[in-house]
Interface confidence: low
């Protein structure tokens, strides 16, 4: 089929286009080109007769068209009016006609765009700016670039007017950037030169540097002021309210104590009309001062308070040093130094943090030390202890009890007997006691500063007869070859002898047995199952004697390597297999069986009726003691022979 291809389809003004003919029929008489979508003599561009090779211009011929023998048409120096359809009329030798239509579009070659702005010096947080991409061009697409990147998503950015106009609402200093616009159509793309948005802002609150506020007499004072501002701020300095100079830096050489005072920097922006000021107080010391330590808490409470120790005064260009107990600071998460080392913070003080603390200021030649500071850490009272520790006394002796509790300030003590207040002293003395003095003796310690109180209660028994003792143990179920056990004979009594028996016999000599605490405590190291015996303690004095009930030690042990019985390993087919497993263990172990590695049952006895050679294999008994956490096992091979044969002989022998 006859077709027309436009090369290119989109044509720039002034360029050329070729209407290329495809599938031109054979045996042609000639052909003719027309402007438009149909054959119209008034709109003929050019005709061509093949036989004479003669081209004849038509009414629509402009002088820019060239026809080729293959019927293609070249149009040069394209103008906007050339846009549209073109029809080729082919006349064949048999005078049968054929037509085809093609088209192209003409676009102008875009000029380089430029950006116009409605506000060349917008003020931050106040003005909006509208950028417009010039010129306005039909059938053009408009794009915008900020710092050579596509537009960020922002509620303050708005495109309008077919994207020709970019509006920035409520501009900020961060909008100071390079803006470009771009125009595009199908035949060209052009980008504008950059426009830099000049946002007026500030001045912000000025900063005065350096931050130091303390100087030594004879030093130079060199203060610099800076405030973010566009255009750059104009600066003025005031000392104690009196104008000094209009410069960004203030320099005073060889300062004296008289230069102490308030120094004000004022920043002014002539375009925004705004002023901002910052004040710093400068202190000039006559000579390097001796440092001293200030504390934010003179009486901190243990485990409650933090203490901040600050080395005074604050001086420019100074290194601060700290010592605790005449040594440099230890590494501790509870000790924190501020960035300038001036402040030492003790987090959650303890009674061990009393110090002394010293700080130092390092000068060019020496280190000036502060006087030591000792922290008065309030703590306690801890649980009071009552001494002596006896609980049994004979009538007629003197009872002298002393109470002590760690505390700062020192605790105030009170004694109560059976809940009744006796006296407010640290010691309690009762002469010539009788059975009536038996009872509950309470010592109460009170810290008046923290308001905390702690008490300890002790039972005192006054009796001519010794009580029946009892045995306490620190481990009721020790594990063999692992644990130790300490038996203690209760109670602790004055002027009393303590004795021990094992299975009704006096103690054997053994490096694993040890008596301590006036023979009151018997310790068995590294217990064994043989230590599972009856232990008895006895007490005696010049008046009486008594013996405890026996305590039997329950030693956990095992499981030992199990034994499978019967010992036979060869069986005849058809017999019953009845295997029993036993392991020495306390408590009794849990049993389980595996045949050829496959778990079977959790019983001590494994029974299989009428075994066959299929029951050949390895039979494993597993034992487990949950109390000791230990395991053990044994494996036995079982061979089953067919009936009528002896194990080890071949069939038919």
């Amino acid at each position: 089929k006859l077709t027309i291809e436009s090369t290119p389809f989109n044509v720039a003004e002034g360029k050329e286009v070729l209407l290329l003919v495809h599938n031109l029929p054979q045996h042609l008489f000639g052909y003719s080109w027309y402007k438009g979508e149909r054959v119209d003599g008034n709109r003929q561009i050019i005709g061509y007769v093949i036989g004479t090779q003669q081209a004849t211009p038509g009414p629509a011929y402009s002088g820019r068209e060239i026809i080729y023998p293959n019927a293609s048409l070249l149009i040069q120096n394209i103008i906007q009016n050339d846009t549209g359809f073109y029809t080729l009329h082919v006349i064949k030798s048999d005078l049968v006609n054929e037509e085809a239509t093609g088209q192209f579009r003409v676009y102008p070659e875009l000029p380089k765009p430029s950006i116009s702005s409605n506000n060349s010096k917008p003020v931050e947080d106040k003005d909006a700016v509208a950028f417009t991409c010039e010129p306005e061009t039909q059938d053009a697409t408009y794009l915008w670039w900020v710092n050579n990147q596509s537009l960020p998503v922002s509620p303050r950015l708005q495109l309008s007017n077919g994207n020709r106009t970019l509006t920035l609402f409520n501009v900020t200093r961060n909008d100071t950037a390079s803006y470009k616009c771009e125009t595009q159509n199908p035949v060209s793309a052009r980008r504008s030169d950059s426009v830099i948005l000049n946002v007026l802002y500030g001045p912000d609150a000025p900063t005065i540097s350096p931050l130091n506020t303390s100087y030594r007499s004879g030093e130079n004072l060199n203060l610099s002021c800076h405030a973010a501002s566009n255009p750059p701020a104009q600066y003025s300095w005031f000392v104690n309210g009196t104008f000094q100079q209009s410069t960004q830096e203030l320099f005073i050489p060889n300062i004296t104590v008289n230069n102490s005072g308030s120094y004000t920097c004022q920043a002014h922006n002539s375009d925004t009309g705004l002023n901002r000021t910052t004040v710093t107080t400068i202190t000039v010391y006559a000579e390097p001062p001796k440092p001293f330590i200030t504390s934010n808490n003179s009486n901190p409470v243990e485990d409650e308070d933090a203490v901040a120790l600050t080395c005074e005064p604050e001086i420019q260009n100074t290194t601060y040093l700290w010592w605790v107990n005449n040594q440099s600071l230890p590494v501790s998460p509870r000790l924190q130094l501020s960035n300038d080392n001036r402040t030492l913070t003790l987090l959650s003080v303890t009674r061990n943090d009393v110090g002394p603390y010293e700080c130092g200021i390092q000068n060019e030649l020496s280190v000036d030390h502060s006087d030591p500071v000792i922290l008065n850490v309030l703590y306690g009272p801890d649980d009071p202890t009552i001494s002596p520790s006896y609980t049994y006394y004979r009538p007629g002796v003197n009872l002298s009890l002393s109470c002590h509790a760690a505390s700062n300030p020192p605790a105030q003590y009170s004694w109560l007997i059976d809940g009744n207040i006796q006296q407010h002293t640290q010691e309690l003395f009762i002469s010539n006691i009788t059975e009536k003095n038996s009872g509950l003796y309470t010592c109460q310690a009170n810290n008046s500063a923290s308001g905390h109180s702690r008490t300890t209660v002790k039972t005192i028994t006054v009796s001519a007869e010794l009580p029946k003792p009892s045995i306490s143990s620190n481990n009721s179920k020790p594990v063999e070859d692992k644990d130790a056990v300490a038996f203690t004979c209760e109670p602790e009594a004055q002027n009393t002898t303590y004795l021990w028996w094992v299975n009704g016999q006096s103690l054997p000599v053994s490096p694993r047995l040890q008596l301590s605490n006036g023979n009151r405590t018997l310790t068995l190291f590294n217990v064994t199952r043989n230590d599972a015996r009856a232990y008895v303690c006895g007490i005696q004095n010049s008046v009486s004697a008594n013996r405890s009930d026996p305590v039997t030690l329950d030693v956990l042990y095992g499981p030992d390597t199990p034994i499978i019985s019967p010992p036979d390993s060869s069986y005849l087919s058809g017999a019953n297999l009845n295997l029993s497993c036993h392991s020495a263990s306390n408590p009794s172990p849990q049993y389980s069986w595996r045949i050829n590695g496959i778990p079977q049952q959790h019983t001590q006895v494994l029974f299989i009726a009428k075994i066959t050679p299929n029951n050949n294999g390895t039979y494993a008994c597993f034992v487990s003691n949950l109390a000791t956490g230990r395991n053990n096992s044994i494996v036995k091979s079982i061979t089953v022979s067919a009936s009528g044969t002896s194990p080890g002989l071949s069939a038919g022998a």
């Epitope: 934010n296 485990d303 409650e304 308070d305 933090a306 901040a308 998460p333 509870r334 924190q336 501020s338 960035n339 402040t343 913070t345 987090l347 959650s348």
Partner: nanobody, 119 residues
Framework: EVQLVESGGGLVQPGGSLRLSCAAS????????IGWVRRAPGKEEELVAD????????RYADSVKGRFTISADTSKNTAYLQMNSLRAEDTAVYYC????????????WGQGTTVTVSS
């Protein structure tokens, strides 16, 4: 070794709640102060809240007062940040840190947990 491990972050709708946890090891939180610091892109780092478990003292940034609650369980050596009425501007990576009682100076960062508040 001092270690701080945060957890509990996630995606939540505006108005929702989250509870962040900070498990401490290598030191006792009773001995110090623990804080929550947040970092969001394009914003300044902000100390949101801190607590000194030894005496229960707490501090909060103005932006979270009344919405966030900091607490500590000394038996578990863990600090918590209960965040209610969450807003889009609370979106950030939240870090647990040891904080100075006096000057809000902080160190010993955890690895952070991300909180995203979005509908």
């Amino acid at each position: 070794e001092v270690q701080l491990v945060e957890s509990g972050g996630g995606l939540v709708q505006p108005g929702g709640s989250l509870r962040l946890s900070c498990a401490a090891s290598g030191f006792n939180i009773k001995d110090t102060c623990i804080g929550w610091v947040r970092r969001a892109p394009g914003k300044e780092e902000e100390l949101v809240a801190d607590i000194c478990p030894s005496y229960g003292g707490t501090r909060y940034a103005d932006s979270v007062k009344g919405r966030f609650t900091i607490s500590a369980d000394t038996s578990k050596n863990t600090a918590y940040l209960q965040m209610n009425s969450l807003r889009a501007e609370d979106t950030a990576v939240y870090y647990c840190a040891i904080v100075s009682k006096i000057d809000q100076y902080y160190n010993y960062w955890g690895q952070g947990t991300t909180v995203t508040v979005s509908s």
